[in-house]
Structures are given as C-alpha cells and as structure tokens.
Amino acid sequence: ALDTNYCFSSTEKNCCVRQLYIDFRKDLGWKWIHEPKGYHANFCLGPCPYIWSLDTQYSKVLALYNQHNPGASAAPCCVPQALEPLPIVYYVGRKPKVEQLSNMIVRSCKCS
Amino acid sequence: ALDTNYCFSSTEKNCCVRQLYIDFRKDLGWKWIHEPKGYHANFCLGPCPYIWSLDTQYSKVLALYNQHNPGASAAPCCVPQALEPLPIVYYVGRKPKVEQLSNMIVRSCKCS
C-alpha cells in the first residue's frame, strides 16, 4: 500500500504519500481553530505508470494509453485513498468545543 | 456537476471531463476485444482552484493551502468521479461472448 509506513521510509519516485505540515493561520488564513495550531495533512505526489496502484479499470486503461502515447495529457493522477479525521478545539463565545474534522489527514494514495 | 453535459459544451479551463477516444489496438495494444474497435473513454483535466468541485474536507484544505502557497507542489488533482461500464464482444475459441467492463467511461470529474 502507498501509505505513510512505506512512503515515508522510502525514496519512492512514483505516486506516494508525502509529508506536508499545514499551519492553520499561515497556510489557510484560519483563525477559528484554537488547537492544534497546525497539523500533518500530507499530500499525494508522483507519476502513475502502468500497474502502479491503479484504482479502477479506467485507471489501468489510461495508464496503458499513456504508455502508448507518452506526449498525451491524459494520464492517471496520484490522489488520496485513505483519509483520517483531525480532532480540533474551537471556541463558541468563551466555551471551548472539541470536534473531529473528517477527512483531513492523508494516510495513503492511489492512482485514479 | 463537472459532467459531459456541462464540460463538452463549454470552454471550461478548470477541472472538467474532456473528450478522449481510445483505439484498443493502436492505443492499448489489445487485440482480444472484437467489438467495439475503440470507445470514448474521456479523461479529466484542468486546475483545481479553491471551491472548484472539491471532493472532501482535505481537498478544500489543500486547495486553500495552494492559494496561500502558489509555488507548492501540493495541490488537488482533477480525477474521475462518475464512471460507466462498456459492453464488449470478445471470443472464446469461435464463440463470441458479451461482457460489461466496469468503470471504463468517465462521465464526470472532481478535484481530489
């Protein structure tokens, strides 16, 4: 699987999950989240050659098409597969609230 | 929706489904499919700015991150959303077989 365990410990050039730290204020302009100040969101990056963790029959077809037509702009793209929630603290008036923001952290990627 | 109805009739620069015809022999090297000789597979292409058909909370965060950090390599990608099957004819010996190949045609796209 193209997950953090594999990707963070390898020098994989193809589609893999990469490390990315996002600071809520600096990178998003969000002031409403009190905690955490930022988080390891990660992101997906790398080419999607034929047979590399392809998502659907269409992805396989497109990767093979790309192999036969190297100059084509049609190619599968490396995108998130497994996403995890992020617990946050925000304030409603003076009262702190804890909430889980769903689908915030990338744990693995796929070629779609 | 970034589907064929909207995308094929517009000059949309952002993520949208684009026309792509794939010839099984020429483009994939497949000789086993008797009919059709090729099909309109389509593909997804175009940038994914903030608020443009974003798939998950993560996609929104990443698009906003990209807006604040324009030079970053982390950005959402335009990928298939709705896929349709393709009926094909192939031969087993001299006997023709009809089968549906699932997830072969892109009908709409999303930013993931």
Partner: antibody, heavy 117, light 103 residues
C-alpha cells in the same frame, strides 16, 4: 539557524513592572506563535501566555490575572513580555519559546527577574 | 484547565538502566503532548513532540508513547549525561500546563 536571544537579568522593586525582550532570527517571526514560560527558583515550569506576531493575537494563563502583557515588534522580530504589579513570588527565570507542531521547539536562554525591596 | 500529573517525582538509577516516566492528563488531549529535558542553569530542551515523535538531533534511546490521557516517556539505556529534570506539557487548549517534573 533559529535563535532566540533574551534581554539581561533585572532587579525590580515590589509594585514595579518589568519588560523582557526576546530577539529572534532564522525563521519567519510573523508566522509562529511565541510562548512565554515562568520558572521560579527550584520550581517547575509555568506557561504564561502566547502571542501570534503576525496579527497580535494573544492567549493568556488566567493565573497571572491580567498582569501579563505580550507584544511583538515585527520590524525587529522581537517579542516582549511585560509583567506588572511585581511581588516577591514573581522572582523567576522567564523564557520565550517558539511554538511549532504541538510543542515549543526553540527556547531563549532565559532572563532572571529578581523582585526585592 | 487541563491538569498534568507526572510521576514519579524523582528517580535514582544506574547507567544503562531503563527509565520510564508517566504523565496523565485530566482529560483527553489526543496526541498533543511534548516531553522536555532541563539541566541545571539551562533552558528546557524539546525531546518528544506529538506524543511519539523524536525531535531533531535527539538520540534514539529516548522515546514517547501513548494518546488520550495516558502517556509514557522512556530512556532505553541511561547515560550519565541524561541526569536532568524531565517535564511533560500538553498542547490541547490554553493554558498549556506542564507536569510537575521528574528528577
């Protein structure tokens, strides 16, 4: 290289105020929260508050009952902690510390403030 | 205010022994915990962040574990230079309280 350099030790009389500075270098000052921590002689660590130099937002520890004011000068990349109405129990080492990734990763060398009549 | 209860208050061990310090939060702080080392006359030094991550340049004999309310800090094989006071600190809503320290 990230560096936080604090002002020299101070001796103050009870009831007075003290302003400790923390000059930073090696990172974008406006993009990280700056925390301040108190450590009385032979005691543990006490979080006082934090400031976001980019917009001046602050969070304070209620324990210091409005006696602490945090400010930042973006032109010199310097953070300040002012403690007013000083009393003997405020005698302590005061640290500035940069906030990063759910921790304080870089600390100043500390400034000793002695309150004595 | 979240209360951090650290134990034990002090330890006396020999070189190469294993050290374990615990820290308990009064409420769920997820993984928002850091561990520091402080030597006499020096500022605290970050060892572990986000409960389990080793800070840059910190020897691998130091490790952290736990999430929620119960956390542990371990030195796998004690070295003479590890003599210090160790503190935990939460980062789950201000004020960011510290544990009492372990000497």
């Amino acid at each position: 290289e990230v560096q936080l350099v604090q002002s020299a030790a101070e001796v103050k009389k009870p009831g007075a105020s003290v302003k400790v500075s923390c000059k930073t270098s090696g990172y974008t000052f406006t993009s990280s929260w700056m925390n301040w921590v108190q450590q009385a002689p032979g005691a543990g660590l006490d979080w006082m508050g934090q400031i976001y130099p980019g917009d001046g937002d602050t969070n304070y520890n209620g324990k210091f009952k409005g006696r602490v004011t945090l400010t930042a000068d973006t032109s010199t990349s310097t953070a300040y902690m002012e403690l007013s109405s000083l009393r003997a129990e405020d005698t302590a080492v005061y640290y500035c510390a940069r906030h990063y990734d759910g921790s304080t990763d870089y600390w100043g060398q500390g400034t000793l403030v002695t309150v004595s009549s | 205010e979240i209360v951090m209860t650290q134990s034990p208050a002090s330890l006396s061990l020999s070189q190469e022994e294993k050290v374990t310090i615990t820290c308990r939060a009064s409420e769920n702080i997820y993984s928002n915990l850091a561990w520091y080392q402080q030597k006499p006359g020096q500022a605290p030094k970050l060892l572990i962040y986000a409960a389990t991550n080793l800070a840059d340049g910190v020897p691998s004999r130091f490790s952290g574990s736990g999430s929620g309310t119960d956390f542990s800090f371990t030195i796998s094989s004690l070295e003479p230079e590890d003599v210090a006071v160790y503190y935990c600190q939460h980062f789950w809503g201000t004020p960011y309280t510290f544990g009492q320290g372990t000497k």
